[in-house]
Amino acid sequence: VPRWRQQWSGPGTTKRFPETVLARCVKYTEIHPEMRHVDCQSVWDAFKGAFISKHPCNITEEDYQPLMKLGTQTVPCNKILLWSRIKDLAHQFTQVQRDMFTLEDTLLGYLADDLTWCGEFNTSKINYQSCPDWRKDCSNNPVSVFWKTVSRRFAEAACDVVHVMLNGSRSKIFDKNSTFGSVEVHNLQPEKVQTLEAWVIHGGREDSRDLCQDPTIKELESIISKRNIQFSCKNIYRPDKFLQCVKNPEDSSCTSEI
């Protein structure tokens, strides 16, 4: 008799999830020799232990603590780039500007990037059929809790000037409900962080508006100022040129506004 299985609203666990996590861990340690002390099998065991046999709507940050401990990593606290709804450009930027780091440039962020996972209460099975959706089912699901946990820790580690890349093409350039707006903003430490500098990325070729005057950016400025952190904002009118100028800063065309 087939066992009844909870049907969630979100997509199921990414295929080859265990293999992908293990392979990514091995790749990461190859690429980042400073993380060679990490035992990737132990990392996978800790990752698995956070959600296997647990109800996928009842996951806590505590469940991820063994994984957090194994994945402890020191990144230069003054070289942190946060992002919201513009992941690809943020990653293209840190690929060129090698001394800056997004969360996905750290081991734990790299392991989980673009993956979905969940288990089932009281069985050791991974659910490849469906997983809880944050809105339609529950917020304390394995994926959401993971990102909340690592994002909080990443923001807490930041110091000096912290940069955030925001998508100027969206109706809410700053969204209070995004991970940046709901977790990272509130976990920057005022005693360590002097300034949050927002880079608003323009989408349209001919878009010359000052998106730093957008009401949602003003809202972000207000939240940040109330936390005793300075705020600054820059328009990036031409993201393609911006990346090109990061690659080749001596290019003559890079003195004008980008």
Epitope: E19, T20, A23, K27, E30, P33, Q95
Partner: antibody, heavy 120, light 107 residues
Framework: EVQLVQSGAEVKKPGATVKISCKVS????????MNWVQQHPGKGLEWMGW????????DVAEKFQGRVTITADTSTDTAYMELSSLRSEDTAVYYC?????????????WGQGTTVTVSS | DIQMTQSPSSLSASVGDRVTITCKAS??????VDWYQQKPGKAPKLLIY???NRYTGVPSRFSGSGSGTDFTFTISSLQPEDIATYYC?????????FGGGTKVEIK
């Protein structure tokens, strides 16, 4: 069985560009970093750079920066190494190579090599 | 970059002889040194990884030792099929760097 099969020998003129391919089989392409190694005739080995095929992230040795582009096509499980502004000293055999799960960070898997000759 | 100084650059020995090759790193590389065998016209072949671990299928006459900056590769009893060039490589830091190679010949 893991296999790395490289494209055939190339003869190029100085100033030209060469693009070498490395098609893999026997494993999931995105699960491993692909490295490229240069060997001049009768000489030693020199690491050129790597690519993480899953994300397209690369790192190229300082000596080759500006002239070497490493790419990957996940739809065909193929890595590429492009070397531009060719000069006679680029005449060499080029290998793709990757690590394995039971070999530390050594390279147990190598392509057969692609000979590039630069001559006017 | 880390320099890997390999010696000797060539050697000639008789079948059954013990052959030793050394590699010195310009800075500490822990035990992240690998040894390769390369025959003419062929790709290198991994023999030893992490200084002293024999790779799968590699005969027991091949061994490696060392850590930090000084590493040794040994063929306990040279066989005719061991005629090749041997390279050390440090895999501790990017960029990976190779020793200059040791050409082993039979007397």
């Amino acid at each position: 069985e893991v296999q790395l099969v490289q494209s055939g020998a190339e003869v190029k003129k100085p100033g030209a560009t060469v693009k070498i391919s490395c098609k893999v089989s026997g494993y999931t392409f995105t699960d491993s970093v692909m490295n490229w190694v240069q060997q001049h005739p009768g000489k030693g080995l020199e690491w050129m750079g790597w690519i993480d095929p899953e994300y397209g992230r690369t790192d190229v040795a300082e000596k080759f920066q500006g002239r070497v582009t490493i790419t990957a096509d996940t739809s065909t499980d193929t890595a590429y190494m492009e070397l531009s502004s060719l000069r006679s000293e680029d005449t060499a055999v080029y290998y793709c190579a990757r690590t394995g799960y039971n070999s530390g960070y050594g390279f147990p898997y190598w392509g057969q090599g692609t000979t590039v000759t630069v001559s006017s | 970059d880390i320099q890997m100084t390999q010696s000797p650059s060539s050697l000639s020995a008789s079948v059954g002889d013990r052959v030793t090759i050394t590699c010195k790193a310009s800075q500490n590389v822990d035990s992240d040194v690998d040894w390769y065998q390369q025959k003419p016209g062929k790709a290198p072949k991994l023999l030893i990884y992490k200084a002293s671990n024999r790779y799968t299928g590699v005969p027991s006459r091949f061994s490696g030792s060392g850590s930090g900056t000084d590493f040794t590769f040994t063929i306990s009893s040279l066989q005719p099929e061991d005629i090749a060039t041997y390279y050390c490589m440090q895999s501790n830091t990017h960029p990976r760097t190779f020793g200059g190679g040791t050409k082993v010949e039979i007397k």
